[in-house]
């Protein structure tokens, strides 16, 4: 059993069919000694006496808020959660696998620069009695400050028969700089608690490698003069790294139909223009990707053909 | 347009072009020691993360862009600040501080020279022959020091006369690779900016 | 599976026209991008030009401009490339070859030996 | 138009062993360079796309790499059906132009 913060503790159990579970001996803060009773959540059923009261914990039905009492007074809670080991492995019921870029992936994490700051994303189909708590640091053995806001839901959509709900969270690191070179990862814990579940995860990443810049910005088109060919440029967007000449970008430029199945024109081009054939119900697109690190492509910025 | 128009300097643009080179030969070698390594802890998640120049080079903080100068988090190990003399840089445009970042880069390549040869005369030893340092990657380190031009002491090529770990010798040289790609990918943005100034 | 066949092989004399034809099959013959490339005895090839089955876009290269016409027909899913004032250096293979994507070639057809002799 | 030379225009090489062929472009293309490979009496077929991308049904021995102006097609260890010519082609503007090949011959 450990504390996860004040009055809130966690239970860690090996879950198997008749498994003997924890002992549990909780202590009632106060100054009192004698006629101190003990009930469950809010039942008025008294499970104990005295300043301890020791439990055996194997399932749900025995965590919860246990409270100590006096004349009718409460005196102090403490809330027990389960932390379920099944087979050696934590579960993992709360958050639901993105399974990208690979399997077992509950958190996403991107960076539009090299700030030091970046974002975190989860998935889960429950909607009520769910709390997050998130904290982060550069490296685990000496960490180094990385301060994250509060977990907020963030989008909501429909699966199929389920509701699916996206909860995200911005973290800055506490003193970044954008050239340096990271030799020690960014650790992301989360802390999620649905009911009396407790579970916890983890991603373990590099700045450099969760890049993700925004579109390219102010697409424009010249159509040149007896040709089917358009000139098409665009800016840095504004959130991207500065000086450009030192955090540079590459680009790819597409020009498609409606239909991915389409035929396309497609360039590749460290500069920030480019010459393509447009098509008729066509759209420009142009998307950005670090020039010498190549992490992920930005979205796609367009502009009808037209 | 965002990035700066600047006709490249013909003294600066062999080493962009070189430096270009030694970024796609270093990636090319970790891509290719990542497949053949493939049992091996070789991937970024997979190996402790350690820079052979740490406190010997600052490479980094000595071509810092003066955009970021101002940052202090950039700042903390600076003893002078900004990114020369090198035959890559006109004689015109040459500052202390960018020999000193041209100058720094040059140690790195040559530390990484040393350790790479050393590694590749024991990979040549390994009966299962498995892996080798790409000839082309070498070559491109040779290429780009020569175009830096800066003479210093010759750093003797370790030899060792215990037997070697193969085991080890080759999780070092995804440790080293994928240390060097960093760097290689910092001395890219470096000549990209040293060229667009 | 996308396949090009090409007319047969054609022999003409210099100042001449030669048509070849292209015709595609297994697949929306308006889906792809249709060009035509040439290579001469023991050379390297040589791009001639783009064709839009889709709407009759076209695009040469700047060598073969004014003496190149592509056209297509799409009721039979056939492309054609007429060269006019053939002469004797226009000797080669000329191929149609196609792809979704305008600028480079995925399916090739056989190609159709062009000899211009007098 | 934009010039693309390869290098060497032939090239010996022992089956089971590497060959490393080069393609140079005049100007910057970024990564757009194609690899085709043609047999005698055949017509061209694409191996490698936007100078690394591989084509499905195409060996794994054939690899592509590059960006700028200078680009790799690496077989990896030659088999007896790979002895060809070997064309790159840029798409970075119009007109599209070939390197003039490299012949890979039996050593």
């Known amino acids: 059993i450990w504390e996860l913060k004040k009055d809130v503790y966690v239970v860690e159990l090996d879950w198997y069919p008749d498994a003997p579970g924890e002992m549990v001996v909780l202590t009632c803060d106060t100054p009192e000694e004698d006629g101190i009773t003990w009930t469950l959540d809010q039942s008025s059923e008294v499970l104990g006496s005295g300043k301890t009261l020791t439990i055996q914990v194997k399932e749900f039905g025995d965590a919860g808020q246990y409270t100590c009492h006096k004349g009718g007074e409460v005196l102090s809670h403490s809330l027990l959660l389960l932390h379920k080991k099944e087979d050696g492995i934590w579960s993992t019921d709360i958050l639901k696998d993105q399974k990208e870029p690979k399997n077992k992936t509950f958190l996403r994490c991107e960076a539009k620069n090299y700030s030091g700051r970046f974002t975190c994303w989860w998935l889960t189909t429950i909607s009520t009695d769910l709390t997050f708590s998130v904290k982060s640091s550069r490296g685990s053995s000496d960490p180094q400050g990385v301060t994250c806001g509060a977990a907020t839901l963030s989008a909501e959509r429909v699966r199929g028969d389920n509701k699916e709900y996206e909860y995200s969270v911005e973290c800055q690191e506490d003193s970044a700089c954008p050239a340096a070179e990271e030799s020690l990862p960014i650790e992301v814990m989360v802390d999620a608690v649905h009911k009396l579940k407790y579970e916890n995860y983890t991603s373990s990443f590099f700045i450099r490698d969760i890049i993700k810049p925004d579109p390219p910005k102010n697409l424009q088109l010249k159509p040149l003069k007896n040709s089917r060919q358009v000139e098409v440029s665009w800016e840095y967007p504004d959130t991207w790294s500065t000086p450009h000449s030192y955090f540079s970008l590459t680009f790819c430029v597409q020009v498609q139909g409606k239909s991915k199945r389409e035929k396309k024109d497609r360039v590749f081009t460290d500069k920030t223009s480019a010459t393509v054939i447009c098509r008729k119900n066509a759209s420009i697109s142009v998307r950005a990707q670090d020039r010498y690190y190549s992490s992920s492509w930005s979205e796609w910025a367009s502009v009808p053909c037209s | 347009r965002n990035l700066p128009v600047a006709t490249p300097d013909p003294g600066m643009f062999p080493c962009l072009h070189h430096s270009q080179n030694l970024l796609r030969a270093v990636s090319n070698m970790l891509q290719k020691a990542r497949q053949t390594l493939e049992f091996y802890p070789c991937t970024s998640e997979e190996i402790d993360h350690e820079d052979i120049t740490k406190d010997k080079t600052s490479t980094v903080e000595a071509c810092l862009p003066l955009e970021l100068t101002k940052n202090e988090s950039c700042l903390n190990s600076r003893e002078t600040s900004f990114i020369t003399n090198g035959s890559c840089l006109a004689s015109r445009k040459t500052s202390f501080m960018m020999a000193l970042c041209l100058s720094s880069i040059y140690e790195d390549l040559k530390m990484y020279q040393v350790e790479f040869k050393t590694m590749n005369a024991k990979l040549l030893m390994d009966p299962k022959r498995q892996i080798f340092l790409d000839q082309n990657m070498l070559a491109v380190i040779d290429e780009l020091m020569q175009a830096l031009n800066f003479n210093s002491e010759t750093v003797p090529q370790k030899s060792s006369l215990e037997e070697p770990d193969f085991y080890k010798t080759k999780i070092k040289l995804c440790i080293l690779l994928h240390a060097f790609r960093i760097r290689a990918v910092t001395i890219d943005r470096v000549m990209s900016y040293l060229n667009a100034s | 599976q996308v396949q090009l066949v090409q007319s047969g092989a054609e022999v003409k004399k210099p100042g001449a026209s030669v048509k070849v034809s292209c015709k595609a099959s297994?697949?929306?013959?308006?889906?792809?991008?249709l060009h035509w490339v040439r290579q001469a005895p023991g050379q390297g090839l040589e791009w001639m030009g783009w064709?839009?089955?889709?709407?009759?876009?076209?695009e040469h290269a700047p060598k073969f401009q004014g003496r190149v016409t592509m056209t297509t027909d799409t009721s039979t899913s056939t492309a054609y490339m007429e060269l006019r004032s053939l002469r004797s250096d226009d000797t080669a293979v000329y191929y149609c070859?196609?792809?979704?994507?305008?600028?480079?070639?995925?399916?090739w057809g056989q190609g159709t030996m062009v000899t211009v002799s007098s | 138009e934009i010039v693309m030379t390869q290098s060497p225009a032939t090239l010996s090489v022992s089956p089971g062993e590497r060959a490393t062929l080069s393609c140079r472009a005049s100007q910057s293309i970024s990564i757009n360079l194609h690899w085709y490979q043609q047999k005698p009496g055949q017509a061209p077929r694409l191996l490698i796309y936007?100078?690394?991308q591989s084509i499905s049904g195409i060996p794994a021995r054939f690899s592509g790499s590059g960006s700028g102006t200078e680009f790799t097609l690496t077989i990896s260890s030659l088999q007896s059906e790979d002895f060809a010519v070997y064309y790159c082609q840029q798409s970075n503007s119009f007109p599209l132009t070939f390197g003039g090949g490299t012949k890979v011959e039996i050593k």
């Open positions: 064709i839009d089955p889709e709407n009759g876009d076209t």
């Open positions: 936007f100078a690394s």
């Open positions: 297994g697949y929306t013959f308006t889906d792809y991008y």
């Open positions: 070859a196609a792809n979704k994507e305008l600028r480079y070639f995925d399916v």
